[in-house]
Interface confidence: low
């Protein structure tokens, strides 16, 4: 018995061939011997089966001795053995129809789980293998779960259903709702304007929700809400903002915040959360601010950084075009009685300069100039 696999909602064509290459009488019946369709001369006739309006044939092929049964908009319950009667012979074709659907919405938050459920006819024992857009393969039976969805899981998932050495392929588009980066770090000199950007890793026609930036300053004992905002159809409107610092927010996506000045008291870590309408859970992005200050008081030249720096970062003070006078894996370095000239304070990671601040040391009778 020939086995044909079909996909729910698709169209399938079951073949039936006579030895005579001409139009002769044929009938297609189901396993209950109920006539589906056949011919009467050059006319197509239909029987009383439940397939009535979804069954068809190709009259253009009858003259070649081919009498296909076409079933449109397949349903799981169309799975059956179909019998073609032609030239006193019976050809049997077993049709198995499968459906594969995502458990919920195909737009899921990063970290959530995706469950794919296979609908299959009774008596079948299929196996399913799905490949994520990043090339990860997952195997399962009637249900297939992927926990902790990542940004790279966005896109078309390709799932192959195997049954009786035959296979049918499904494509499901999954959108993982997330920020493009889980975390970012901004390095700024004291007094500089700070730009925080929170680009989303997905696009949807209408985006509505609300968000908030909580900030934990390194110098503060507790975190505080710096800004709350609403998002309506991709338009951003600020609901509430602290007076210190007075953040400014862009009116369009990507979410964009401006801190007028980088000051030591602002250095720290923030967590931007975005709650989307009709979604449980929130999107998160961490943002970190590191602030540098170089100062000269009397005979002491000091360079300090505030904020979440990694222990491997190096802080150095050097006179321009000379070797570093002091270099430490610490958050403050200083030089006593610095010689006159342009001094550089450098924060670096494995030799790569992340942040630089210059301070001009004048001969001892003058006061310092900060560029």
């Amino acid at each position: 018995k020939k086995v044909v696999l079909g996909k729910k909602g698709d169209t399938v064509e079951l073949t039936c061939t006579a030895s005579q290459k001409k139009s002769i009488q044929f009938h297609w019946k189901n396993s209950n011997q109920i006539k589906i369709l056949g011919n009467q001369g050059s006319f197509l006739t239909k029987g009383p089966s439940k397939l009535n309006d979804r069954a068809d044939s190709r009259r253009s092929l009858w003259d070649q001795g081919n009498f296909p049964l076409i079933i449109k908009n397949l349903k799981i319950e169309d799975s059956d053995t179909y019998i073609c009667e032609v030239e006193d012979q019976k050809e049997e074709v077993q049709l198995l129809v499968f459906g594969l659907t995502a458990n919920s919405d195909t737009h899921l938050l990063q970290g959530q789980s995706l469950t794919l459920t296979l609908e299959s006819p009774p008596g079948s024992s299929p196996s399913v293998q799905c490949r994520s857009p990043r090339g990860k393969n997952i195997q399962g039976g009637k249900t297939l779960s992927v926990s902790q969805l990542e940004l790279q899981d966005s896109g078309t998932w390709t799932c192959t259903v195997l049954q009786n050495q035959k296979k049918v392929e499904f494509k499901i588009d999954i959108v993982v709702l997330a920020f493009q980066k889980a975390s970012s770090i901004v390095y700024k000199k004291e007094g500089e304007q700070v730009e925080f950007s929170f680009p989303l890793a997905f696009t949807v026609e209408k985006l509505t929700g609300s968000g908030e930036l909580w900030w934990q300053a390194e110098r503060a004992s507790s975190s505080k809400s710096w800004i709350t905002f609403d998002l309506k159809n991709k338009e951003v409107s600020v609901k509430r903002v602290t007076q210190d610092p007075k953040l400014q927010m862009g009116k369009k996506l990507p979410l964009h915040l401006t801190l007028p000045q980088a000051l030591p008291q602002y250095a720290g870590s923030g967590n931007l959360t975005l709650a989307l309408e009709a979604k449980t859970g929130k999107l998160h992005q961490e943002v970190n601010l590191v602030v540098m200050r170089a100062t000269q008081l009397q005979k002491n030249l000091t360079c300090e950084v505030w904020g979440p720096t990694s222990p491997k970062l190096m802080l150095s003070l050097k006179l321009e075009n000379k070797e570093a006078k002091v270099s430490k894996r610490e958050k403050a370095v200083w030089v006593l009685n610095p010689e006159a000239g342009m001094w550089q304070c450098l924060l670096s990671d494995s030799g790569q300069v992340l942040l630089e601040s210059n301070i001009k040391v004048l001969p001892t009778w003058s006061t310092p100039v900060q560029p």
């Epitope: 959108v175 680009p199 997905f202 990671d349 790569q352």
Partner: antibody, heavy 118, light 108 residues
Amino acid sequence: EVQLVESGGGLVQPGGSLRLSCAASGFTFSNYDVHWVRQPTGKGLEWVSTIGTAGDTYYPGSVKGRFTISRENAKNSLYLQMNSLRAGDTAVYYCARGGYDYYGLDVWGQGTTVTVSS
Amino acid sequence: EIVLTQSPGTLSLSPGERATLSCRASQSVSSTYLAWYQQKPGQAPRLLIFGASSRATGIPDRFSGSGSGTDFTLTISRLEPEDFAVYYCQQYGSSPFTFGPGTKVDIK
């Protein structure tokens, strides 16, 4: 100045091996995804490989199993080990940096030429 | 594999004219993952547009990108002499991260 400099190209016989290097400077290398892209003379661009910040690697079918991408963050270096080379691998090989918070190759090297010929 | 098709293959225009370049994907690509590059002879490519419509740093505002799903467009509002080059689109939506075959914009 943000810069990528490729080296290691040259003439190699079919079936041979070559190791390309890319030296990065002017940015925190470990924070970025990095890529190899090639371009045969007079033809278009072809993506060859990507290595993510977590060391995750990606290849197209044409080089999978023959090429290996790796990175050494301490040395700000990216590598491409190419084995079982074919004439079809002849091209200018560029290393490129992936955008920090977006998808796009925002910094490119000047390229190094690989010729596979007997 | 997502196949990107660029059209036209060559676009012959005069300085000051508007150029419209098309990039069509064989399957839907999130606009987040679509980028455009410019390449001049003997040079490495240069990123123009990321996220289908965001200009990269230092790119003049005569360059703009648009589109979603399977159809994307790069527009150069008024061609300057330095804009005559080959333009490629690239998708990151699914590995392999394919490039389009390119559109050459040359002087009429």
